[in-house]
Amino acid sequence: MAVTACQGLGFVVSLIGIAGIIAATCMDQWSTQDLYNNPVTAVFNYQGLWRSCVRESSGFTECRGYFTLLGLPAMLQAVRALMIVGIVLGAIGLLVSIFALKCIRIGSMEDSAKANMTLTSGIMFIVSGLCAIAGVSVFANMLVTNFWMSTANMYTGMGGMVQTVQTRYTFGAALFVGWVAGGLTLIGGVMMCIACRGLAPEETNYKAVSYHASGHSVAYKPGGFKASTGFGSNTKNKKIYDGGARTEDEVQSYPSKHDYV
C-alpha cells in the first residue's frame, strides 16, 4: 500500500513539475525590467526564451520573437536546450510511469517490469528536474552578471552631454516557476525510485529445504515473505506447495474496485 502511494504521489508531483517546466519555458517573463532606483519609464520591458515584450502605460503590449538562431547569445541557446531536454525527458518519463503505475493493470505485466519502468521514469524525472534547475540557474547567473555590468555603466554618454539610460533586467516570474517546477520534478523522480525498491520482488538468499513428513513428501520453498537483504534475482517467487501464505504482491494483484482495467 505504501509503495503504491509513494509511486502515485511521485507520479503526481512529477506531473505538476513537468507542467511547471513547460509553463516556465513558454513564459515571457524570464527577465523583467528592474524598476528599483531607475528612472520611471512609461514602458515595462520583459523578455522570455523565445521573444521580448514591451507593455506600454496604456496597457498595449507588443511582443517580438527572436527570429534568428545564429544571432542569439550562446547562453540563451544553452538554456533553451536544457529546458527542451528537460521537457522531452519529463514527457517520456510520464509516459513510462503511467504504464508502471501499480494501480493500473496492463495485460499480464510482470511486477519486475513495472519496477524497472518505475526506476526508469524516476531517473528520467530526476534528470528532467536537474535540466530545468540548471537552465533556470544559468539564465539567472546571466542576469546577475548583466545587471551589475549595466549598473556599472548605467549612464553612458558622449562627453557627458547626452545620456543613455541602460535598461537593467532582474529575475522574472518564470525563473521562480522553473526552480519550483524543477524541484518538484526532482522530488517526484526520487519518490519513483524509492517506490521502485518496494515494487521489486526479491528471492531469499538461501536454498529450498526439503522436509520429510510421515504421510507424503512435500518440498517447501519459502516464499511467503521477502528477504530483507536486498540481494537475489527479481524473478517472481513461485510456491511448489500451495498451502502456504500468499506473497505481498499476489495479495495486491487481485482485482478490486480501485483497479483500472
Epitope: 512609461a42 514602458v43 520583459y46 514591451v54 502605460s57 496604456s58 496597457g59 498595449f60 517580438r64 539610460v165
Partner: antibody, heavy 120, light 113 residues
Framework: EVQLVESGGGLVQPGGSLRLSCAAS????????IHWVRQAPGKGLEWIAY????????YYADTVKGRFTISRDNAKNSLYLQMTSLRAEDTAVYYC?????????????WGQGTTVTVSS | DIVMTQSPDSLAVSLGERATISCKSS????????????LAWYQQKPGQPPKLLIY???TRASGVPDRFSGSGSGTDFTLTISSLQAEDVAIYHC?????????FGQGTKLEIK
C-alpha cells in the same frame, strides 16, 4: 466621435482650491489612461498628471506633487483634478488628454481646455 | 527630468516649400526592449488644443496628411512638412513619451514667409 470636455475652471485666490472635471464620451473610458496637461499664457505645454485605466498607476509632475490629486470615476466616464494650495504660477489652460492605446504613449485626443486663473 | 529642446523657436517658410523642425532630448528615447523611439509631435493652432501628428518618432496619426513626416532616433528627431500649406501655420511641440514626467519641447512657431 471621441470627446473630452473639461469644466470647473475659474478665478481663485492664491492658497485656494479648485476641482476640475473632464467628461469623456465616444469611447470606452475605462480602457484608457488619461493625462492632465496645462499651458500657461504664451508658454509651452506642461504635463502635470496621469492616471491609468484602473487607477492603479498615478504619476505627477514634481511641480504639483502633494498639491494636486488626479482621480477618475469609470462608472461616470469622468476624470478629476483636485487642486489645492494654488499659486500664481498655476494659472493656465488645463487640458485633459487621452493616452492612446497603440500610439507609443502619445496623447491622441485632447479636450478644449478650461482656464484656471490664480490671482488676488 | 528629460529636457526637450526644439529649434528653431520660430520659422518662416514660403507656401509649397519644405519646413524642418528639430528636437533634441537630453536622454535617448529609444527603448531597448523593442527598439522603438518614444517621441511624439503635436500641432497646436491658435486658440485650439494640441493635435497628435506623429508618434513613435515616425508614425503618422490617423487623418494626418502625408506631407507631415517624422524621423530620427535616440536623441535627435526631426519633423518635416514637405510642402507647406496655409493651414499648417501653428505651433509644433515635441514630447518625450518614454520617461515620467512626460516632457514637452518649448514649441516652434511656424509662419508663412
Amino acid at each position: 466621435e471621441v470627446q473630452l470636455v473639461e469644466s470647473g475652471g475659474g478665478l481663485v485666490q492664491p492658497g485656494g482650491s479648485l476641482r476640475l472635471s473632464c467628461a469623456a464620451s465616444g469611447f470606452t473610458f475605462s480602457d484608457y489612461g488619461i493625462h492632465w496637461v496645462r499651458q500657461a499664457p504664451g508658454k509651452g505645454l506642461e504635463w502635470i498628471a496621469y492616471i491609468s485605466r484602473g487607477s492603479s498607476t498615478i504619476y505627477y509632475a514634481d511641480t504639483v506633487k502633494g498639491r494636486f490629486t488626479i482621480s477618475r470615476d469609470n462608472a461616470k466616464n469622468s476624470l478629476y483634478l483636485q487642486m489645492t494650495s494654488l499659486r500664481a504660477e498655476d494659472t493656465a489652460v488645463y487640458y485633459c488628454a487621452r493616452g492612446g492605446y497603440d500610439t507609443r504613449n502619445a496623447m491622441d485626443y485632447w479636450g478644449q481646455g478650461t482656464t484656471v486663473t490664480v490671482s488676488s | 527630468d528629460i529636457v526637450m529642446t526644439q529649434s528653431p523657436d520660430s520659422l518662416a517658410v514660403s507656401l509649397g516649400e519644405r519646413a524642418t523642425i528639430s528636437c533634441k532630448s537630453s536622454q535617448s528615447l529609444l527603448n531597448s526592449g523593442n527598439q522603438k523611439n518614444y517621441l511624439a509631435w503635436y500641432q497646436q493652432k491658435p486658440g485650439q488644443p494640441p493635435k497628435l501628428l506623429i508618434y513613435g518618432a515616425s508614425t503618422r496619426a490617423s487623418g494626418v496628411p502625408d506631407r507631415f513626416s517624422g524621423s530620427g532616433s535616440g536623441t535627435d528627431f526631426t519633423l518635416t512638412i514637405s510642402s507647406l500649406q496655409a493651414e499648417d501655420v501653428a505651433i509644433y511641440h515635441c514630447q518625450n513619451d518614454l520617461y515620467y514626467p512626460l516632457t514637452f519641447g518649448q514649441g516652434t512657431k511656424l509662419e508663412i514667409k
